[in-house]
Interface confidence: low
């Protein structure tokens, strides 16, 4: 015999208390597949989370993060605060990248500048706390007088952030 509950579509549940009639999901709940015996409670986007997609009877709410934060984890299970480019998030908040490192995003950690000499290349553009160095041709490729490359400006020291 076919399970009568299998006829209940998404957005409903098979109500055992009412002779297995398909009842609509109550407010703030959903069922994304047919044949469900219960509806799941909708996710609530509270605090640092904000609603990206409202809950419907057939699909859960989706959250993202309030301004100044970004999602982490599957389905935006966590919000982590943004830093500015040139910074990384530490336990004490956003801190400038140390000299010799950079971060070109609002998340993640500061990473060391590329060491051009490891590839036998020269530094074409010096790095900053927001940008990696740009490696140019190897020094041997630059015969005297043939170079159109201007000498790189001194690397910018990380700026001070009043904290």
């Amino acid at each position: 015999l076919q399970d009568p509950c299998s006829n209940c579509p998404a957005g409903t549940f098979c109500d055992n208390n009412r002779n297995q009639i398909c009842s609509p999901c109550p407010p703030n709940s959903f069922s994304s597949a047919g044949g469900q015996r219960t509806c799941d409670i909708c996710r609530q986007c509270k605090g640092v989370f904000r609603t990206r997609k409202e809950c419907s009877s057939t699909s859960n709410a989706e959250c993202d993060c309030t301004p100044g934060f970004h999602c982490l984890g599957a389905g935006c299970s966590m919000c982590e605060q943004d830093c500015k480019q040139g910074q990384e998030l530490t336990k004490k908040g956003c801190k400038d990248c140390c000299f010799g490192t950079f971060n070109d995003q609002k998340r993640g950690i500061c990473r060391p500048w590329t060491n051009c000499s490891l590839d036998g290349k020269s530094v074409l553009v010096n790095g900053t706390k927001e940008r990696d160095v740009v490696c140019g041709p190897s020094p041997a490729d630059l015969s005297p007088g043939a170079s159109s490359v201007t000498p790189p400006a001194p690397a910018r020291e990380p700026g001070h952030s009043p904290q």
Epitope: C94, S161, P162
Partner: antibody, heavy 119, light 107 residues
Framework: QEQLVQSGAEVKKPGASVKASCKAS????????IHWVRQAPGQGLEWMGR????????EYAQKFQGRVTMTRDTSTSTVYMELSSLRSEDTAVYYC????????????WGQGTSVTVSS | DIQMTQSPSSVSASVGDRVTITCKAS??????LSWYQQKPGKAPKLLIY???RKVDGVPSRFSGSGSGTDFTLTISSLQPEDFATYYC?????????FGGGTKLEIK
Amino acid sequence: QEQLVQSGAEVKKPGASVKASCKASGFNIQDTYIHWVRQAPGQGLEWMGRIDPANGNSEYAQKFQGRVTMTRDTSTSTVYMELSSLRSEDTAVYYCTTGNLHYALMDYWGQGTSVTVSS
Amino acid sequence: DIQMTQSPSSVSASVGDRVTITCKASQPINTYLSWYQQKPGKAPKLLIYRVNRKVDGVPSRFSGSGSGTDFTLTISSLQPEDFATYYCLQYLDFPYTFGGGTKLEIK
């Protein structure tokens, strides 16, 4: 020594605009956000918005949307706040303030610019 | 917008008293709350951020606590220089919003 120095007091007529300046010294404004907060006589503090001097992006409180414009001149480390269509209830002291967004918000303040709107 | 309801709006107290000021957010604000002190004719001064982290130089008699929607600033033993107006601020979301302020007066 981190410091924010604001422009002097202004007296304006209703309907006019005011442009207050805020000059930073002792730090790189591109590493911070600059906020503007106002305080009407005998009243509390009201956040108007902020600008990221690194790129000029700004966020404004809905209440001031369309009337306020925040700009910056990185060459002089100065941020500006322009408020248009002034009315008497805009009479207030306008403060610029700075601080890393999440670490210690608004920890350095200018001395304030007094704006009086009167016919 | 997130509303910040601060109470009491004013309080009279004596030197040496313990004073508690509360701030209630209209929705959870995680730990994105700070406290400011303002004296007449002066710009506000940041005392505490992220609920309970004191700024360097702020005396140990000031402390902050709370989470979610309910937050408290406590001054354990009032000193003459503490008589001022205190404001809470939420900075979880735009627009950032201040509480209405608590004026701390000498009894």
